[in-house]
């Protein structure tokens, strides 16, 4: 149930109260202010909204609203010297170029400030070469060209499609397979849903539509010169060359109409399977180079961006906690867009200000959260989710002994079909209560809860009855609270049905045709589904700020590690022979599991029979709720990845966006057969499982009766 | 209305250099690839050149290939000819003539819908 | 280069009655995403020229229904259903499937 405990004498003030105050209208008005010009992080427009919405955090009544500033590494396009693709004949001289910009969106033909489409942090360049097309660049179709067709990438540029993993992700793999560049292009197989008009007619991609992006590997790293520690004014700065994840190659991106010019020309090994081909009318061979007529042309490309040291400006709100002050629950999500942001990030940061509005007219009836909730509005999480990051380094002591949870409020929706959620398995219960609880936006669900709906479209995998709720990956502002600092941590927005929609993410994401009009012509023109996602976000705040007990259930924790642990003993297990030749055993693994069941389910007994009353066993029991998460960090990190220390989980190595399980265990048995010293590598899986036991049986003791 | 407006022709010695401008209005000028077409007296038409609405590709006639060059200034609404090394055969009714299809719907070069009213060029001693 | 060949030179009309003019191209005009790049213009005296047809049979806006366009491949015809005065003209045919863009050399068209 809702918690009905406001620290207000008046019982009206109760979770109902702040769910009425929220109104799609104010929603829908928010949003077309935010989206009117670019924000692109580093820039004066951006620091102007942070200064606007810092003066309307404090009319909406929060205590406090401050702007915290860091000086971080940023990538602009040079003004003067665009980048673009060419095709180049045996003289050198260009045949064909890439477009410079994408035709501007009808009524924003004369803003001024859109960016062109580039890949932010791209080096400097020039190379030419022949063409190398190599489907989504992930680690899978490296392994399929260099292993099973023998094709060398080396010295050759790439062409890959976007979609399926991190953009980041592809650029590694290209330079590690040797390749002197990369062009990213969106297929209309990933970014064009049959039977939908492209933009302004619809909300497909159109053929001049460009994916913009970071290319970084930082691996939760933050600011490039400054891992670690926050990019403040007396902060020491590595050198570019010591610079963290910055890519070595080129890289640019380019629409459809601009890679049907390239691709159609392409000669060399026909695509190994249909898996390889998207719905261009292209062959999709994938070279090397042009086809017998064009063979003496080749691909050059020109790539003049710069890394420039800028400042950047978080938002950081207030509202004080009247019991517990110093526990924090925060909500926070991204201002700075790519161009419009009409979906990303504005339709999140939309309803984190009605969230703040709804909360601010309850403080100012007198009501406080028993706990203190921080908003946020962060800067550059496009280039690599510096804002949030930075802020976090900069007050990692206080989030680590203070941070009861963080809610993620980046785009609202990227679709209108159901609720998706991502969030630690502490919060599962909290959803599933909650969404119960509130009524249902979808068509044929009138008069029923989120919760049937979201069950019956986006049902769980493993349990009937329920709905799916998704392991954290990363590519977001949550990264640095879950990832690094243990803090208990969800998301959660409207998506597509991804039964029928097979494209990656939405068509228009990150492109110049992420408007206003877009979300309200074709997405929620309501502002419905909007709605249930202030009311899902806002709900899971509300409850985490003002239940006496934290609304956390350790049970499910116990559930997810049991079938974790057996999944990566089942990808182990693949290899009978060297588990029993190298002693391998997962024993360790699944007693702790076993040790942290039984733990958890007394631990859970005792939170139902404590004396409430007595705030000292209260705190003590919240906080061993709230150091759960804590535990299952190790201060070593993952190899290689010092800033991804959580064990259970962490950003998939081939693919940011994508959460692990044991990420450790996995890292160390992926691709094991390749390697060429197998005892080595088997111990190195040995060594993992040793860590990831100790670390679920040392969570389990601190669910234990303390004395 | 959509209008195009052509100027800039005249008189001029062979040899010699001469610009030819179209100022656009009525319509998204940024949104359109745009062409040159010529006539000379009594003869049929003739394509001299295209510029992609961004500017990012020019392509010429061979007639007219390394002395004519296609530009455009989004922020003014107006597409340019700079014709050098005029010769006699190039005197004719210049016309500027919008993309039938704005860059958001097409990538290929399409025909032209509208035209403006043309320049005449002279060459001649 | 694409060379576009027109029929007849030229046509004397008596007015209500119709009249064909035939196109053929040296190669064909179906581009691989389906679109066939043929146009027609008329060319009224002293005037600029003025798109009637695009991709080979659709009337552009304001071109009155007398006009219609068909054709595939390599062999177009444009027909006036009922000649009016106001027709007359040098009519073009232009293909757009490659650079350069390639004229016909034009029909004139008469009233008797």
């Known amino acids: 149930k809702s918690s009905n405990e406001a620290t207000n004498i008046t019982p009206k003030h109760n979770m109902k109260a702040f769910l009425d105050e929220l109104k799609a209208e104010n929603i829908k008005k928010f949003l077309y202010n935010f989206t009117q010009i670019p924000h692109l992080a580093g820039t004066e427009q951006n620091f102007q909204l942070a200064k606007q919405i810092q003066s309307q955090w404090k009319e909406f009544g929060l205590d406090s609203v401050e702007l915290a500033h860091y000086d971080v590494l940023l990538s602009y396009p040079n003004k003067t010297h665009p980048n673009y693709i060419s095709i180049i004949n045996e003289d050198g001289n260009e045949i064909f170029n890439t477009s410079l910009f994408e035709p501007p969106p009808p009524g924003y033909e004369n803003v001024s400030d859109i960016v062109p489409p580039f890949s932010a942090f791209s080096p400097q360049g020039m190379p030419e070469g022949d063409l190398v097309y190599v489907n989504y660049a992930r680690t899978e179709d490296f392994f399929k060209l260099e292993r099973d067709m023998k094709i060398n990438c080396s010295g050759k540029i790439v062409i890959a499609r976007y979609g399926k993993v991190f953009r980041g992700n592809k650029v590694k793999n290209a330079q590690l397979a040797g390749a002197k560049g990369v062009i990213l292009y969106s297929d209309p197989a990933d970014y064009f849903a049959p039977g939908v008009k492209s933009y302004p007619d619809g909300w497909n991609l159109p053929g001049g539509g460009v994916q913009r992006g970071n290319i970084l590997n930082l691996n939760g790293a933050g600011d490039p010169l400054t891992p670690g520690y926050p990019a403040n004014e007396y902060a020491y700065r590595r050198g570019i060359a010591e610079a963290v994840g910055l890519p070595s190659i080129p890289v640019h991106p380019i629409g459809y109409y601009d890679a049907q010019k390239l691709l159609e020309k392409m000669g060399g090994s026909a695509p190994p399977d249909s898996s390889w081909r998207g719905s261009l009318k292209v062959p999709y061979n994938v070279g090397p180079g042009f086809t017998g007529n064009f063979s003496t042309q080749k691909v050059k490309m020109h790539i003049h961006s710069t890394n420039e040291v800028t400042r950047i400006y978080n938002v950081i709100g207030t509202l004080r906690g009247a019991v517990e002050p110093d526990r924090y629950v925060i909500l926070g999500g991204h201002r700075d867009s790519w161009v419009f942001g009409g979906i990303d990030p504005q339709s999140g940061a939309a309803v984190v200000h009605e969230i703040v509005r709804s909360f601010g007219t309850l403080k100012k009836e007198g009501w406080r959260p028993r706990r203190t909730i921080l908003f946020a509005s962060w800067d550059a999480e496009e280039f690599g989710l510096l804002g949030s990051t930075e802020w976090a380094e900069e007050n990692s002591r206080l989030l680590q002994e203070r941070g009861v949870a963080y809610i993620n409020a980046d785009s609202s929706i990227e679709g209108n079909y159901t609720l998706r959620v991502d969030c630690t398995p502490l919060m599962y219960s909290l959803v599933h209560n909650l969404t119960k609880e509130l009524k249902s936006p979808d068509e044929g669900f009138e008069g029923k809860s989120l919760y049937e709906s979201w069950t019956k479209k986006s049902p769980s995998p493993e349990f009937s009855g329920m709905p799916r709720i998704s392991k954290l990956g990363s590519g977001n502002d949550f990264e640095v609270f879950f990832q690094r600092l243990g803090i208990a941590s969800g998301r959660a927005r409207y998506t597509k049905n991804w039964e029928t929609n097979k494209f990656s993410g939405y068509p228009l994401y990150h492109s110049v045709y992420e408007t206003y009009e877009l979300v309200e012509k074709f997405y929620d023109p309501m502002f419905k589904y909007h709605l249930t996602v202030a009311q899902v976000r806002g709900g899971m705040v509300f409850e985490l700020a003002n239940s006496i007990v934290l609304p956390f259930d350790c049970r499910d924790y116990a559930v997810v590690l049991r079938k974790y642990a057996d999944k990566i003993y089942s990808i182990s297990m693949k290899h009978p022979q060297e588990m029993k030749t190298y002693s391998v055993s997962f024993d360790s693994l699944f007693s702790a599991v076993k040790n942290f069941t039984e733990i958890a389910s007394k631990f859970s007994e005792r939170l139902q029979d404590f004396d409430k009353s007595n705030p000292i066993v209260l705190r003590m029991m919240n906080d061993q709720l709230m150091f759960l998460e804590r535990a299952f960090i190790d201060p070593l990190g993952l190899p290689d990845r010092p800033f991804y220390r959580h064990v259970i989980y962490a950003p998939s190595s081939h693919n940011k966006y994508a959460g692990e399980s044991f990420p450790g265990i996995y890292d160390a048995l992926f691709d094991i057969e390749s390697k060429v010293d197998p005892s080595k590598a088997w111990g190195e899986v040995k060594r993992q499982i040793y860590v990831a036991a100790f670390t679920v049986q040392a969570a389990a003791e601190t669910l234990s009766e303390v004395a | 209305q959509v209008q195009l407006v052509e100027s800039g022709g005249g008189v001029v010695q062979p040899g010699r250099s001469l610009r030819l401008s179209c100022a656009a209005s009525?319509?998204?000028?940024?949104?359109?690839?745009m062409h040159w077409v010529r006539q000379a007296p009594g003869k049929g038409l003739e394509w001299v050149a295209v510029?992609?609405?961004?500017?990012?590709?020019?392509y010429y006639a061979d007639s007219v290939k390394g002395r004519f060059t296609i530009s455009r200034d989004n922020s003014k609404n107006t597409l340019y000819l700079q014709m050098n090394s005029l010769r006699a055969e190039d005197t004719a009714v210049y016309y500027c003539?919008?993309?039938?299809?704005?860059?958001?719907?097409?990538?290929?070069?399409?025909?032209?819908?509208?035209w403006g009213q043309g320049t005449t060029v002279t060459v001649s001693s | 280069d694409i060379v576009m060949t027109q029929t007849p030179l030229s046509l004397s009309v008596t007015p209500g009655q119709p009249a064909s003019i035939s196109c053929k191209s040296s190669?064909?005009?179906?581009?691989?995403?389906?679109?066939?790049?043929l146009y027609w213009y008329l060319q009224k005296p002293g005037q600029p020229p003025q798109l009637l047809i695009y991709?080979?049979?659709n009337r552009f806006s304001g071109v009155p229904d007398r006009f219609s366009g068909s054709g595939s491949g390599t062999d177009f015809t444009l027909k006036i259903s009922r000649v009016e005065a106001e027709d007359v003209g040098l009519y073009y045919c232009?293909?757009?499937?490659?650079?350069?863009?390639?004229f016909g050399g034009g029909t004139k068209v008469e009233i008797k």
């Open positions: 003539a919008r993309v039938l299809v704005g860059a958001l719907y097409y990538y290929n070069y399409y025909g032209m819908d509208v």
């Open positions: 009525g319509f998204t000028f940024i949104s359109y690839g």
């Open positions: 510029i992609s609405y961004d500017g990012s590709n020019k």
């Open positions: 190669q064909s005009l179906l581009h691989s995403d389906g679109k066939t790049f």
């Open positions: 991709e080979v049979s």
């Open positions: 232009m293909q757009s499937i490659q650079l350069p863009l390639t």
